[in-house]
């Protein structure tokens, strides 16, 4: 089900990420270090439990979840959010909610790449990963 996402991925390009973070409400200082980070993303599946680990000089984070089941998450930028991740047309679609706000993070395969689309209101950031 999520097997196409399993593996270690490295960030190779990032577009519009600062504007996305601004729209999310991330402060200047946090945007500065988050924007400089080049994270590796490690995705694994154990039964119905999916784990996504992000490792960078900025922060290491890890989420473990079952599809369709809401969970608590502390994001790399230090938001405490309620998240839910579902599989939609082969993409992992995550919705984070906090402080009356909501953002969507879509992870999808595109050829040999993993593309992450982050959307907040009208602002979209696209971050592309390749296998490490």
């Amino acid at each position: 089900m999520c097997d196409a996402f399993v593996g270690t991925w490295k960030l190779v390009s990032s577009e519009n990420f600062d504007d996305y973070m601004k729209e999310v409400g991330v402060g200047f200082a946090t945007r500065k270090v988050a924007g400089m980070a080049k994270p590796n993303m490690i995705i694994s599946v154990n039964g119905d439990l999916v784990t996504i680990r992000s490792e960078s000089t900025f922060k290491n984070t890890e989420i473990s979840f079952k599809l369709g089941v809401e969970f608590d998450e502390i994001t790399a930028d230090d938001r405490k959010v309620k998240s839910i991740i579902t599989l939609d047309g082969g993409a992992l679609v995550q919705v984070q909610k906090w402080d009356g706000k909501s953002t969507t993070i879509k992870r999808k395969r595109d050829g040999d790449k993993l593309v992450v689309e982050c959307v907040m209101k009208g602002v979209t950031s696209t971050r592309v990963y390749e296998r490490a």
């Epitope: 409400g25 402060g27 270090v33």
Partner: antibody, heavy 119, light 108 residues
């Protein structure tokens, strides 16, 4: 519990330099920006600059760029601010504070170091 | 530079009175990045309200914060003696980080 420890006072002569310290404990030092703030007697708060201990990256107030140099020693979880070419205008209380991510507000403050520049 | 203008600069309130302090921002910022601090004489500032409306740990519920864009406020529903202090607003949405000049609140 999070603590930021600063010396209570420093007395230095005009023209000299001083290195103020801020020792952090109770959290992962490399994960939060440390900020320095100046407060002259009876005045408001003035931002000097930030340093991110995880990388050494700094963000400085242009006004203090030639006055203040920010560094960290991660082995001792201590942030430092060196102030150079001191004058009476530099006499003030200097606070260090921890920046909480996302919101970027100061969730913990040191007690402040009172710097007196006098001959 | 984003300028934060606090008003009033000085005010006095009687116990039980409602108090509102405003912070006007020279250009629009994210409400997540507007904060308030309380400072009493000879002590460090304390985080009081963060992200416009979130009360910091230990802050009495008589305090509240609101606003968006360029206009923000801190409100005390019923003034108490221990609320006498100077309050500063601060933003770190845009470079450089800036503080308001402060509002000194005295007990009448």
């Amino acid at each position: 519990q999070v603590q930021l420890q600063q010396p209570g006072a420093e007395l230095v002569k005009p023209g000299a330099s001083v290195k103020l310290s801020c020792k952090a404990s109770g959290y992962t030092f490399t994960s939060n920006w440390i900020t320095w703030v100046k407060q002259r007697p009876g005045q408001g708060l003035e931002w000097i600059g930030d340093i991110y201990p995880g990388s050494g990256s700094t963000t400085n107030n242009e006004k203090f760029k030639s006055k203040a140099t920010l560094t960290v020693d991660t082995s001792s979880s201590t942030a430092y601010m060196q102030l150079s070419s001191l004058t009476s205008e530099d006499s003030a209380v200097y606070y260090c504070a921890r920046l909480r991510g996302y919101y970027d507000y100061f969730d913990f403050w040191g007690q402040g170091t009172t710097l007196t520049v006098s001959s | 530079e984003v300028v934060l203008t606090q008003s009033p600069a000085l005010m006095a309130a009687s116990p039980g009175e409602k108090v509102t302090i405003t912070c006007s921002v020279s250009s629009s910022i994210s409400s997540s990045n507007l904060h308030w601090y309380q400072q009493k004489s000879e002590t460090s500032p304390k985080p009081w309200i963060y992200g416009t409306s979130n009360l910091a740990s230990g802050v009495p519920v008589r305090f509240s914060g609101s606003g968006s864009g360029t206009s923000y406020s801190l409100t005390i529903s019923s003034m108490e003696a221990e609320d006498a202090a100077t309050y500063y607003c601060q933003q770190w949405s845009h470079y450089p980080l800036t503080f308001g000049a402060g509002t000194k609140l005295e007990l009448k």
